[in-house]
Structures are given as structure tokens and as C-alpha cells.
């Protein structure tokens, strides 16, 4: 039993972690600067998307890049519990705090703000430079989706790295996982064409959920053959003229649930991965 | 002046490097096994490409993946001159060999075989599983292209890493370069749509040349609107019914030079990067 409550311990761990973050601002500022620069570069490359076949390719390309970038950037989250492993064991054994207080304290003060910022920055810069769907709900759905991808990828990093002493193995494992997840995200291969004995792997792909949600959000209702007269040559039948046609060819459900089920899946993955990370910390102290 | 000729020194360095390679086969065998497994996975995912709109997406996707994989795999080449830096300086000062003998010896015995193997393995496995263009010349052009990409990426790695003492900085720099090169390769963004003040960057992108060559090789003469005569005059700007239409939309020159200029560009990059690497080794010994 502890003399202090869970909430008091949580506040204490959060406060200390946040102070460490502010006391060593180089890393945080560097991350923000890199994100801003990358956002501006992406914005410049894709500036002012067209409503034609290149518009389809460029929309899909930029959404894929943003999704996979969120994943690979989250690899750095492996450090969260690794670098302080000895300190955690020492302080836990000394009775400073519960595992749960330390776990949620670190998440609240470190993971939550540092994974939220890039999503906000990217969306704010990229959205208007590219001229994505000009509605408030589409803007915030994109921001929320990128956050969910970042959180689920970071949670996976924690689940793999928690309790380990070296970062390198976890980083390598994460990178390999993300490469395979990237293949199954839906840009490099049309997911409807994969053999059934392999296609189930797509349901374990974090970028697949993020990319699907971003595409559903952006493509629905778009016209990619604007002004195409109904009297023209028949070869236009092979064109992808609407966002719905594109989404259907990608095997994406057009209903509202077709959007939100991706966020539900990401939320489930976050819960599962964080539970694994927590249990690993719990078992770590038992064997320390 | 040296008592032994350049050729003798070259043979000696090559022989020793090759012996080291055979004496520590784990790394080489591991690389081959990983390449075979990845080749089989890619083959299974993309098995039997269709001749419809999904066939366009899947062909482009797999060619993009193979190109970027060759690039990112080549990051490991940074180690070639870094891990033996102290030994090289010691042996050079002791008059064992010329810088040129060491440089070309290492390239011949280490870089040449270890970068050639993945290209051969990937092509042999993937080509037939996917059902790519069933002609011998297309098969060997693909193999040659993947080799050229691997060599130019490895040469870039050497140019960046030569003379350095730690691998990590060079690896990070390489990775960042390849991420930007990947954006400009032509899948994630239609290169014809990039603003002129930015589009010149594509000419510095290794995967862009590889990807363009692979697409030119695979798409030319393909029909993606089954049941529609491919020779019919297509007045629709939105449909992609032939490989030629697809390549034109990507801004790819359909002439034979449109294929080979990519290999010429990669060859030029190899020469430039290897020259930089050689000069860095040359200056290294002056300051040691």
C-alpha cells in the first residue's frame, strides 16, 4: 500500500516528465522545426491539387506519405520507457509510485503532446496549400486521423520496447513491421486483388486504417472529370470520374461507417498495445 | 613509389576482402535469405497481375517498392570504408597499397557481388510470380535497372560515408536523402504537376530514374481496358486504356531513349559519387 494516492503520484510523474521536456527543449523544438519544414516542402510539391487523373494520383500520394510518415516518425517513441528503465525500477522498488501512475504519467506528459503536435502542424500547413476538401469537418477529420495513426504507431512502439534495455532492436523490429504494414496500406497494392489467404494481413496494418480514413474523407463527392460532356467518346467509361468510383475500386466502403470504422480499429489497437506495454512494465518489476 | 604494381595490390585487397566475406558468411547468407523471403512475399502479394485499372496500380506499386527497397537496402554500404578506416590508414601509411588499389579492391570484392545478388534474386522470383511482360529483353532490362539503382544508391552511401568514423550520421543523412528522393520518384506525386521552381529536384533522385526505367520497360504496349481495341482513337483525357497513355500522363518519354537515358543518368551518378568517395579517401590519408 502507498501513502500517496494514484492521482497524486500521476501528477508528480507528469510534472517531472513535463519539466524534463521543457528543461531540454532542443529535441521538442527540433521536432517542431522539422515538421514545419517537411510540411512546407510537401505543401510546395503538391501545391494546388487538380481535379483530373493527376489529382487522384497526387491526393492518394500525399495522404499515403503523411500516413506512413506519422508511422515511421513514431518509431522514436521506443525510447519513452527504455532510457529511464533503471530509474523506473529504482523508484518503483523504493515505493515512489505505482506502475500505473508512472505509465499514465509518462503518456500524459510526454507521448500525448509530442505525438499531437506533428498532426496539428501537418494538417494546418498542408491542408490549405494543397486545397483539400474545403469543409471544416473534413479538415478536423484529417487532423484527428493523423493523430490516431501517430498514437497507434507510438503505442505499438511502446508495446515492443517496454522493459527492454536497448533501443536498437526495438527500432529495427518496428521498422520491419512498418515496411510490411506500408505495403498493405492500399497504395502500393490494390487490396481487393490480394489473395484471400494473405489479405487478412491488411487488418493488422496501422497505415491502412489511416490511409483509408484519409481517402474516404477527401475523395467522397469529388469530380475528377469535370465538364466531361456526356456526348464524348466511349473510352471515357474506363476513366475514374468520381471519388466514389476511385474508393470503390480500392475496396473502400462509402458509408459513414466506412470512415469511422478505421478510427475504431485504431482506437482498439491503441488500447491493446498500451495494455501490452503496461503488462510488460508490470512483469518487469516482478523480475527486477 | 611502390614495389608492387597497382594490379598486384588490387588482387591482394580483393582477395583479402573476399576471404573476409566468405570467412564470415552469416551476413551474406542472412542478406540472401532476407531477399528471397521478401521476394516471395512480394510475389505472393502481387501474384498474377491483372490487365485492368488495378493492374496499373499494382504494377506501379511493385516497381516503386522494388526501386525504393534497393535504395534503402543500400544504406548498409556506408559501412564499407567506415569500419576498416583505422586499418586502412595504418596499412596505407605502412605502404601496403595505393588508395586506388584499396578503393577498387573493396568495390570489386565487396560492393559488386553484394549489390548484384539482391537484384538477380528479386527479378528471378518476382518476375514470373507477377507475370510481368513475358519477353527476355524486358526481364534482363529489369534486372539491369535494379542493379544500376543499387549501385548508384551504394555509391552515394560511399560518397557520404567515406572517411567518417561513425556510421550513424551517414545513415541518418542517407535516409533523409532517400525519403526526399522517394517523393520525387514519380508514384507519390505526378512529376508533370510539380511547379517548375521545384521540379528540377527530380533529376537528383536515384529512385526516379530506376522507377521510370522499370515503368517504361513494363507498361509499353500493355492494354488496360480489356474488350476495347487498344488501337481505337482515344479522345478521352481521363481514361488510361494503354500503357502508353499511362506513361504519357506520368510525363515519360515513350522512345527507346526514354528508357536508356535513365541508365545513363544512373551511370553518371555512380561515376560522380565514386569519384567523391575516392577523393575523400585520398584527402583522408593526407590528414591522418
Amino acid at each position: 500500500s502507498y501513502t500517496t494516492s494514484f492521482c497524486h503520484q500521476l501528477r508528480w510523474v507528469s510534472k517531472r516528465s513535463f519539466k524534463n521536456l521543457l528543461g531540454n527543449p532542443q529535441a521538442s523544438i527540433a521536432q517542431i522545426i522539422v515538421t514545419v519544414i517537411l510540411g512546407l516542402v510537401i505543401g510546395a510539391i503538391y501545391f494546388g491539387l487538380n481535379n483530373d487523373s493527376t489529382g487522384i494520383q497526387n491526393r492518394a500520394g500525399v495522404l499515403f506519405f503523411l500516413t506512413t510518415n506519422q508511422c515511421f516518425s513514431s518509431v522514436s517513441a521506443v525510447e519513452l520507457f527504455v532510457v529511464e528503465k533503471k530509474l523506473f525500477i529504482h523508484e518503483y522498488i523504493s515505493g515512489y509510485y505505482r506502475v500505473s501512475s508512472y505509465f499514465f504519467g509518462k503518456l500524459l506528459s510526454d507521448l500525448l503532446p509530442m505525438r499531437m503536435l506533428p498532426s496539428i502542424i501537418f494538417t494546418c500547413i498542408v491542408y490549405f496549400m494543397l486545397g483539400l476538401k474545403p469543409t471544416a469537418d473534413a479538415f478536423f477529420i484529417m487532423m484527428f486521423t493523423l493523430m490516431m495513426v501517430a498514437y497507434s504507431a507510438s503505442s505499438m512502439a511502446l508495446a515492443i520496447a517496454a522493459g527492454q534495455s536497448v533501443v536498437s532492436v526495438a527500432t529495427l523490429l518496428m521498422t520491419i513491421c512498418f515496411v510490411f504494414m506500408m505495403i498493405f496500406s492500399g497504395l502500393l497494392v490494390n487490396l481487393t486483388t490480394i489473395a484471400s489467404w494473405l489479405s487478412w494481413l491488411q487488418y493488422f496494418s496501422i497505415p491502412r486504417y489511416g490511409f483509408t480514413a484519409l481517402q474516404h474523407n477527401e475523395f467522397l463527392g469529388q469530380n475528377f472529370c469535370p465538364g466531361l460532356n456526356a456526348t464524348v467518346n466511349n473510352t471515357c467509361n474506363y476513366a475514374t470520374c468520381t471519388g466514389e468510383e476511385y474508393l470503390t475500386k480500392q475496396g473502400i466502403d462509402l458509408s459513414p461507417w466506412g470512415l469511422w470504422k478505421n478510427h475504431v480499429a485504431l482506437a482498439c489497437m491503441i488500447v491493446i498495445f498500451l495494455t501490452i506495454a503496461y503488462l510488460k512494465l508490470l512483469f518487469l518489476k516482478k523480475y527486477s | 613509389s611502390y614495389t608492387t604494381s597497382f594490379c598486384h595490390q588490387l588482387r591482394w585487397v580483393s582477395k583479402r576482402s573476399f576471404k573476409n566475406l566468405l570467412g564470415n558468411p552469416q551476413a551474406s547468407i542472412a542478406q540472401i535469405i532476407v531477399t528471397v523471403i521478401l521476394g516471395l512475399v512480394i510475389g505472393a502479394i502481387y501474384f498474377g497481375l491483372n490487365n485492368d485499372s488495378t493492374g496499373i496500380q499494382n504494377r506501379a506499386g511493385v516497381l516503386f517498392f522494388l526501386t525504393t527497397n534497393q535504395c534503402f537496402s543500400s544504406v548498409s554500404a556506408v559501412e564499407l570504408f567506415v569500419v576498416e578506416k583505422k586499418l586502412f590508414i595504418h596499412e596505407y601509411i605502412s605502404g601496403y597499397y595505393r588508395v586506388s588499389s584499396y578503393f577498387f579492391g573493396k568495390l570489386l570484392s565487396d560492393l559488386l557481388p553484394m549489390r548484384m545478388l539482391p537484384s538477380i534474386i528479386f527479378t528471378c522470383i518476382v518476375y514470373f510470380m507477377l507475370g510481368l511482360k513475358p519477353t527476355a529483353d524486358a526481364f534482363f532490362i529489369m534486372m539491369f535497372t535494379l542493379m544500376m539503382v543499387a549501385y548508384s544508391a551504394s555509391s552515394m552511401a560511399l560518397a557520404i560515408a567515406a572517411g567518417q568514423s561513425v556510421v550513424s550520421v551517414a545513415t541518418l543523412l542517407m535516409t533523409i536523402c532517400f525519403v526526399f528522393m522517394m517523393i520525387f520518384s514519380g508514384l507519390l506525386v505526378n512529376l508533370t504537376t510539380i511547379a517548375s521552381w521545384l521540379s528540377w529536384l527530380q533529376y537528383f533522385s536515384i529512385p526516379r530514374y530506376g522507377f521510370t526505367a522499370l515503368q517504361h520497360n513494363e507498361f509499353l504496349g500493355q492494354n488496360f481496358c480489356p474488350g476495347l481495341n487498344a488501337t481505337v482513337n482515344n479522345t478521352c483525357n481521363y481514361a488510361t486504356c494503354t500503357g502508353e497513355e499511362y506513361l504519357t500522363k506520368q510525363g515519360i518519354d515513350l522512345s527507346p531513349w526514354g528508357l536508356w537515358k535513365n541508365h545513363v543518368a544512373l551511370a553518371c551518378m555512380i561515376v560522380i559519387f565514386l569519384t567523391i568517395a575516392y577523393l575523400k579517401l585520398l584527402f583522408l590519408k593526407k590528414y591522418s
Epitope: 472529370c225 469535370p226 465538364g227 460532356n229 471515357c236 470520374c241 | -
Partner: antibody, heavy 118, light 106 residues
Framework: EVKLLESGPGLVKPSQSLSLTCSVT?????????WSWIRKFPGNKMEWMGY???????NYNPSLRSRISISRDTSKNQFFLQLNSVTTEDTATYYC???????????WGQGTLVTVSS | DIVMTQSPSLLSASVGDRVTLSCKAG??????LAWYQQKLGEAPKLLIY???SLQTGIPSRFSGSGSGTDFTLTISSLQPEDVATYFC????????FGSGTKLEIK
């Protein structure tokens, strides 16, 4: 010359299904284009309802997706509209038209008035 | 959905007059706008597409202009057969129609 003609009952009871047929002449519906349904309410408000493509793929207005179905009979060169659980709000003149994607409608039928009333 | 607002809802003009009909979009629709003419008891007829392109077989007295959110249909010299209701349609995002302008002769 492409011609489209709508047919179906002029009166439908609330909560029942509205079913209309569009017969196409001068063009085979499987050869190309998207075959649409549009309706014009009393008071001139017009609404695109959905279409069935030459390949049989359907695309519906999101506001109607839960109760609309468009199908076809290729042997008769006809396509159909079914709207379930109708209310008096569905009283309108229903048109069929030829289009490609979300674009201007170059060919229209004459329209058929459907009244929903008990 | 993008809301299309047409004004006026009723317009009276004399034969030979230059008539201007307005259509406003709730958001930027580039130039993805079409104009239709519908006479009583008839199907709508496409007049203009892409804001300013005249459909084949339509008299040259009809012209369209505008881009972004504000569009106009102009009849340079009103004829008796032009009495009809005129609709605009946007096709930038899904497709929606304006509520129409009824044109009559004084």
C-alpha cells in the same frame, strides 16, 4: 439519337416503395456512361438521386443511400429506380438521364410525376 | 452539400432585352457549373457547361461567365421561345442544383 423514357405508377402510398423504369433507345446501356435518376420537387428544387454505370456499379446521393436502389435489365435496355419507405416529401417529377460521373446531363427523359399520398 | 442560390426567382423582361441570371455557390466550385433551360412540360435542356462553354446546337445568344462562387447566364437578345425556368448545376463536389429562375416576357 439517344432517347430515354420514364414509366411507373403516378400514385404511391406513404411507407410503400416507389418503383420506376427508364427505357433507353438509340444506345446500349452496357456500352458506356452512367444512367442517372434526378427528381424535381414542387417549388422547383432539383435533386440528383444516383446512377448505375455501364458496368453495373451504383453510386447514390448520401442523403438517400439508406433507402434507394438502382438496378438494370440489360436484355431490355432498361434501368430502374426503387425508393423505399416513401413519405409525402418524395412527391416530385422523376427524370432519368445519361451522364458520366458528376457532370452536366446532356440527355434527359420527359419525366414522370409521382405523387405520394394516402 | 454545396448550396446553389439563384436570383432572382422570377424575372420579367421584354423581347430583345439583354437578360442576366445569377447563380451563387456556397463555396468555391472553380468553373464547374452548368446551365439548363426547362420549358413547361419538357425535360431540361443543357445550355452551358464549364461555366462558359456553349453546348452543341444552342443559339449563340446564350453565354455564361464567372468562376469560383459567382456565375451568370446572359441572353444577349431575349426571344419569345426563351420563356422557361433556368437552373444552374454545380459538379465540383457531388452535384447540386439551384432552385431556378423563372423567366417571362413582359
Amino acid at each position: 439519337e439517344v432517347k430515354l423514357l420514364e414509366s411507373g405508377p403516378g400514385l404511391v402510398k406513404p411507407s410503400q416503395s416507389l418503383s420506376l423504369t427508364c427505357s433507353v433507345t438509340g444506345y446500349t446501356i452496357t456500352s458506356g456512361y452512367d444512367w442517372s435518376w434526378i427528381r424535381k420537387f414542387p417549388g422547383n428544387k432539383m435533386e440528383w438521386m444516383g446512377y448505375i454505370s455501364y458496368s453495373g456499379w451504383t453510386n447514390y446521393n448520401p442523403s438517400l443511400r439508406s433507402r434507394i436502389s438502382i438496378s438494370r435489365d440489360t436484355s431490355k435496355n432498361q434501368f430502374f429506380l426503387q425508393l423505399n419507405s416513401v413519405t409525402t416529401e418524395d412527391t416530385a417529377t422523376y427524370y432519368c438521364a445519361r451522364v458520366r460521373g458528376y457532370n452536366p446531363f446532356a440527355y434527359w427523359g420527359q419525366g414522370t410525376l409521382v405523387t405520394v399520398s394516402s | 452539400d454545396i448550396v446553389m442560390t439563384q436570383s432572382p426567382s422570377l424575372l420579367s423582361a421584354s423581347v430583345g432585352d439583354r437578360v442576366t441570371l445569377s447563380c451563387k455557390a456556397g463555396q468555391n466550385i472553380n468553373n464547374y457549373l452548368a446551365w439548363y433551360q426547362q420549358k413547361l412540360g419538357e425535360a431540361p435542356k443543357l445550355l452551358i457547361y464549364n461555366a462558359n462553354s456553349l453546348q452543341t446546337g444552342i443559339p449563340s445568344r446564350f453565354s455564361g461567365s464567372g468562376s469560383g462562387t459567382d456565375f451568370t447566364l446572359t441572353i444577349s437578345s431575349l426571344q419569345p421561345e426563351d420563356v422557361a425556368t433556368y437552373f444552374c448545376q454545380q459538379y465540383n463536389s457531388w452535384t447540386t442544383f439551384g432552385s431556378g429562375t423563372k423567366l417571362e416576357i413582359k
